[in-house]
């Protein structure tokens, strides 16, 4: 099974070759590289010296290789770099090149979501609801789920909304949002709405939104 | 005058299933927020499900994924359909209309008992 690795969005994955070199091989005598699962070469280290001329435009001046790890550092990274990776070591002899080691690792690359942010979309309407937006962006993977919580003096609830989500094009990073419209389910001076952004790893929660209903007005007949 | 009357409570072993009904008059169901509570005795009520005015459903956090509130409009009727009920799930079921636009008045019915046996 691949080694699993994760890393960021914009920063930098350690995808290592994890080679004991038991026979205490010189990089003079070998010839490493890595590559994706289309094949596509990220890094040629031939005899001891890096090797451009086999890399892909993808992967150009965006890997760096330790030679005391054995393990190859992609930078600035992108979704689109997720997926597996092998580095492969062969032995050159007079006789041609054997393969003595391969290692395979699967790379998945996250990015947070920025905290959800509430954005009420009308006033207070006639003291009983509220209509409003939570969003957040820029994240990856898609989150799980995003819902609202209202809390009143004497109860909690959570009101699960129908999340809308984009992804961008070019980074295929994801916004996502919800809209709902929460009626107060109690007559209370004091209400505190929470937006909550639910992914396989985290809760994010927004700042409390807090509202002070007024008081109740007079039926229209009433004459003071 | 507005009168909501519940019912569907009873006796029901723990594992089981129930469906409150909330049927009212003088008022409608459409264009206002629904709300069933429960209280057991010595304790305050606590809200365990709404559903707003445009339809977003809400519910407390011990009964998330257990109960299920919804209405029939024409029938002027809210329901409670409650799955999985636990021995915690005992209480008087209230069922509330409100707080109405602008004068926030708020109706209740007269609850239904739902006791959860072993």
């Known amino acids: 099974a691949p080694l699993k690795i994760q890393a960021y969005f914009n920063e930098t994955a350690d995808l290592p070759c994890q080679f004991a070199n038991s026979q205490n091989q010189s990089l003079s005598e070998l010839v490493v590289f890595w590559q994706d699962q289309e094949n596509l070469v990220l890094n040629e280290v031939y005899l001891g010296k890096e090797k451009f001329d086999s890399v892909h435009s993808k992967y150009m001046g965006r890997t760096s290789f330790d030679s005391d790890s054995w393990t190859l550092r992609l930078h600035n990274l992108q979704i689109k770099d997720k997926g597996l990776y092998q580095c492969i070591i062969h032995h050159k002899k007079p006789t041609g090149m054997i393969r003595i080691h391969q290692m395979n690792s699967e790379l998945s690359v996250l990015a947070n979501f920025s905290q959800p942010e509430i954005v009420p979309i009308s006033n207070i309407t006639e003291n009983v609801y509220i209509n409003l937006t939570c969003s957040s962006i820029h994240g990856y993977p898609e989150p799980k789920k995003m819902s609202v919580l209202l809390r009143t003096k004497n109860s909690t609830i959570e009101y699960d909304g129908v999340m809308q989500k984009s992804q961008d094009n070019v980074t295929e990073l994801y916004d996502v949002s919800i809209s709902l419209s929460v009626s107060f389910p109690d007559v209370t001076s004091n209400m505190t709405i929470f937006c909550i952004l639910e992914t396989d790893k985290t809760r994010l929660l927004s700042s409390p939104f807090s509202i002070e209903l007024e008081d109740p007005q007079p039926p229209p007949d009433h004459i003071p | 005058e507005v009168q909501l009357v519940e019912s569907g409570g009873g006796l029901v072993q723990a594992g089981g299933s129930l469906r409150l009904s909330c049927t009212g008059s003088q008022i409608s169901f459409s264009d206002n927020t629904m709300n069933w509570y429960r209280q057991v005795p010595g304790k305050q009520r606590e809200l365990v499900a709404s559903?707003?005015?445009?339809?977003?459903?809400g519910y407390a956090d011990s009964v998330k994924g257990r109960f299920t509130i919804s209405r029939d409009i024409a029938g002027n009727t809210v329901y409670l359909q409650m799955n999985d009920l636990k021995i915690e799930d005992t209480a008087v079921y209230y069922c509330?209309?409100?707080?109405?636009?602008?004068?926030?008045?708020?109706?209740w019915g007269q609850g239904t008992q739902v006791t959860v046996s072993s």
């Open positions: 559903l707003s005015i445009f339809g977003a459903t």
């Open positions: 509330k209309l409100g707080p109405v636009r602008r004068s926030r008045l708020e109706y």
